[in-house]
């Protein structure tokens, strides 16, 4: 029983939660909350926006996002690819894991024009020691932050 | 390979289905079955719709809900909240954990009265011993429950 | 930490991922992906779209689809449904585990006829040595795979 | 357990105005429903007139749409149907019925008894 | 708008049979069709919903499958009180339609 807690205790595991800061509208990866609230980092750890491995070996990684808007301004993309990537020192570009596309806009109707949709994304992936997993949205600006919630990032060990 | 087969065998989990009975319609959580078809318990407890924890520690919890309906006599701006929710004694009101918002009535057009949507929601929380998660829908009307495989409740320590 | 290693490097995990050849057109289920790529199997194996166990227990499986058309052909199903099936020895026919439906396409707008949906499930089910879970996907013609990250499936045991 | 009754005059005169209400007892109209209107003339089918929620959103069948208006009054727990330049094709049995709009159970479950409605001069 | 078409439109048939009436929708509705039963001077009444659900008091000798165009309502062994009308509809489109009916007999 010692040994059974003992390895739970050790398990690596990460629950990060979207905060104000998270969209930098920079073209980079969304950024998260670590620490506060529902947050917590345990044998991974976390760097701009990604979360790092530092035990080799296979994670389910997962990553919610709230979306919302008031219709479809011209402007933004009528589709949205939320995705997790793998950044790798083997190779130059991200990777990517696990991605969705949805066309939430059409769920504003001439009736209302408010529109709600959430992207749910999880998966097996294997991570070496130093890899680095991230979440980005196109557009980010249809991204509903608000209290942690609705829009969060994690992973465990398998 | 002993200790490890142990080792899977006392990891809490619990996968809970949808059931005739889930509606209340008292402002309530959701209620689940807990032993029937696909449902089960172990190391997990259950009481009024709620995940028990019996052991401290991290855990992946989920729920997917079935929403439909025909048309939208609520209107079509009408938001469907779905979450999860933690019960503590250290706090007077429960507390979200992961929650999505949608706007499942956008699905129904011209050609399709009928609309069918679906919302998942999963993540890593720590839960003490005693401390309950429950799983809310709002409006609870638009669950499909019927056959358990649709909308189901579980968790497993990580 | 030697046990605790081996235990995780022992667990049973599997990520398959879309390919060109995933879309039979026959009826029956998906086909995956077992090697390239992202996809990998540990501990559990692969027979005809089928995930199969080698070890009893308690798994938690899961699946993504990406969907996606133009418009909405009266010839198509207005109403797509997304399932994990298990199949035992013990029954002539499927068995129903997790099912998803939705109606995507209301999301075709007069601005854009195109139009994509992502359905997820995942949960815990029981499974026997030799027992097999697949996917289903009704139409699977809605069914877009591309590159392997917008649609898979897998498991681990928990 | 919910019950529907139709009220309204029974001869109404070509060119005219036919107006009906179904008042809704042992439930409440601020529901998850349509609340529709169905008609059969005499020896023949059914036909869908249109539907209203409680918040008064409608649908009408496009081949009545012209002349057909319905309202909700949750005061009074009731809905109505207004179809106007009414003909002796508009004679028929005219039922307010429950449709179920939630996501375990669709269907008209609930009907008035009907009242018929002639049109003559 | 969808057509339904019933058929057959009447049919004669004695207590104790199992009688099957099938309906035709112009284009796919999915499982959004219902079956009604209407006997001389009474509203219709609800027997199956979503294809091949049974509404909640109506006999399980009543039971409904389809999807998609083509549907059925079969009737599995006769009893008095089944000689009547029966109408599918579509719920799945507006307009919503009904079939036209088929007059069940005595034989």
């Known amino acids: 029983l010692i040994q059974e807690r003992r390895s739970h205790q050790n398990n690596p595991a990460a629950h990060l939660t979207g905060a104000n800061s998270s969209l930098t509208g920079s073209g980079g990866p969304l950024l998260w909350e670590t620490q506060l609230g529902l947050a917590f980092l345990r044998g991974l750890d976390y760097h701009d926006g990604a979360l790092v491995a530092n035990k080799a070996g296979y994670y389910y990684i997962y990553s919610k996002v709230q979306l919302g808007g008031v219709g479809c301004p011209l402007g933004l993309a009528s589709t949205i690819t939320h995705g997790l990537y793998k950044r790798t020192p083997r190779y130059p570009e991200e990777l990517e894991l696990l991605v969705s596309q949805q066309s939430p806009c059409g769920r504003a109707t001439s009736n209302s024009r408010v529109w709600w949709d959430s992207s749910f994304l999880g998966g097996v992936v294997h991570l070496e020691v130093g890899e680095e997993v991230v979440v980005r949205v196109l557009d980010e600006r249809l991204v509903r932050l608000r209290d942690g919630t609705r829009s969060y990032f994690g992973a465990f060990m398998v | 390979l002993i200790q490890e087969r142990r080792s899977h065998q006392n990891n809490p989990a619990a996968h809970l289905t949808g059931a005739n009975s889930s509606l209340t319609g008292s402002g309530g959580p959701l209620l689940w079955e807990t032993q029937l078809g696909l449902a089960f318990l172990r190391g997990l407890d259950y009481h009024d719709g709620a995940l028990v924890a019996n052991k401290a520690g991290y855990y992946y919890i989920y729920s997917k809900v079935q929403l439909g309906g025909v048309g939208c006599p609520l209107g079509l701006a009408s938001t469907i909240t779905h979450g999860l929710y933690k019960r503590t004694p250290r706090y007077p009101e429960e507390l979200e954990l992961l929650v999505s918002q949608q706007s499942p009535c956008g699905r129904a057009t011209s050609n399709s009265r009928v609309w069918w949507d679906s919302s998942f929601l999963g993540g890593v929380v720590h839960l003490e011993v005693g401390e309950e998660v429950v799983v809310r829908v709002l409006d609870e009307r638009l669950v499909r429950l019927r056959d358990g495989t649709r909308s189901y409740f579980g968790a497993f320590m990580v | 930490l030697i046990q605790e290693r081996r235990s995780h490097q022992n667990n049973p995990a599997a990520h398959l991922t879309g390919a060109n050849s995933s879309l039979t057109g026959s009826g029956g289920p998906l086909l995956w992906e077992t090697q390239l790529g992202l996809a990998f199997l540990r501990g559990l194996d692969y027979h005809d779209g089928a995930l199969v166990a080698n070890k009893a227990g308690y798994y938690y499986i899961y699946s993504k689809v990406q969907l996606g058309g133009v418009g909405c052909p009266l010839g198509l199903a207005s109403t797509i449904t997304h399932g994990l099936y298990k199949r035992t020895p013990r029954y002539p026919e499927e068995l129903e585990l997790l099912v998803s439906q939705q109606s995507p396409c209301g999301r075709a707008t007069s601005n854009s006829r195109v139009w994509w949906d992502s359905s997820f499930l995942g949960g815990v089910v029981h499974l026997e040595v030799g027992e097999e879970v697949v996917v289903r996907v009704l139409d699977e013609r809605l069914v877009r795979l591309r590159d392997g990250t917008r649609s898979y499936f897998g498991a681990f045991m928990v | 357990q919910v019950q529907l009754q139709e009220s309204g005059p029974g001869l109404v005169k070509p060119s005219g105005t036919l107006s009906l209400t179904c008042a809704v007892s042992?439930?409440?109209?601020?529901?998850?429903?349509?609340w529709n209107w169905v008609r059969q003339p005499p020896g023949k089918g059914l036909e869908w007139i249109g539907e209203?929620?409680?918040?008064?959103?409608?649908n009408y069948n496009p081949s009545l749409k012209s002349r057909v208006t319905m309202s909700v009054d949750k005061a009074k727990n009731q809905f109505s149907l207004k179809l106007n330049s009414v003909t002796a094709a508009d004679t028929a049995v005219y039922y307010c019925?429950?449709?179920?709009?939630?996501?375990?159970?669709?269907?008209?479950?609930?009907w008035g008894q009907g009242t018929t409605v002639t049109v003559s001069s | 708008a969808i057509q339904l078409t019933q058929s057959p439109s009447s049919l004669s048939a004695s207590v104790g049979d199992r009688v099957t009436i099938t309906c035709r929708a112009s284009?796919?509705?999915?499982?959004?069709l219902a079956w009604f039963q209407q006997k001389p001077g009474k509203p219709p009444k609800l027997l199956i919903f979503?294809?091949?659900d049974l509404e909640s008091g109506v006999s399980s000798r009543f039971s409904g499958s389809g999807s998609g165009t083509d549907f059925t309502l079969t009737i599995s062994s006769l009893q008095p009180g089944d000689f009547a009308t029966y109408y599918c509809?579509?719920?799945?489109?507006?307009?919503?339609?009904f079939g036209q009916g088929t007059r069940l007999e005595i034989k």
């Open positions: 019925a429950r449709e179920r709009a939630v996501a375990d159970y669709h269907g008209m479950d609930v």
């Open positions: 042992g439930g409440s109209i601020s529901s998850i429903n349509w």
């Open positions: 209203v929620s409680h918040s008064g959103i409608t």
């Open positions: 284009q796919g509705i999915s499982s959004a």
């Open positions: 979503d294809a091949s």
């Open positions: 509809q579509q719920f799945n489109s507006y307009p919503i339609t």
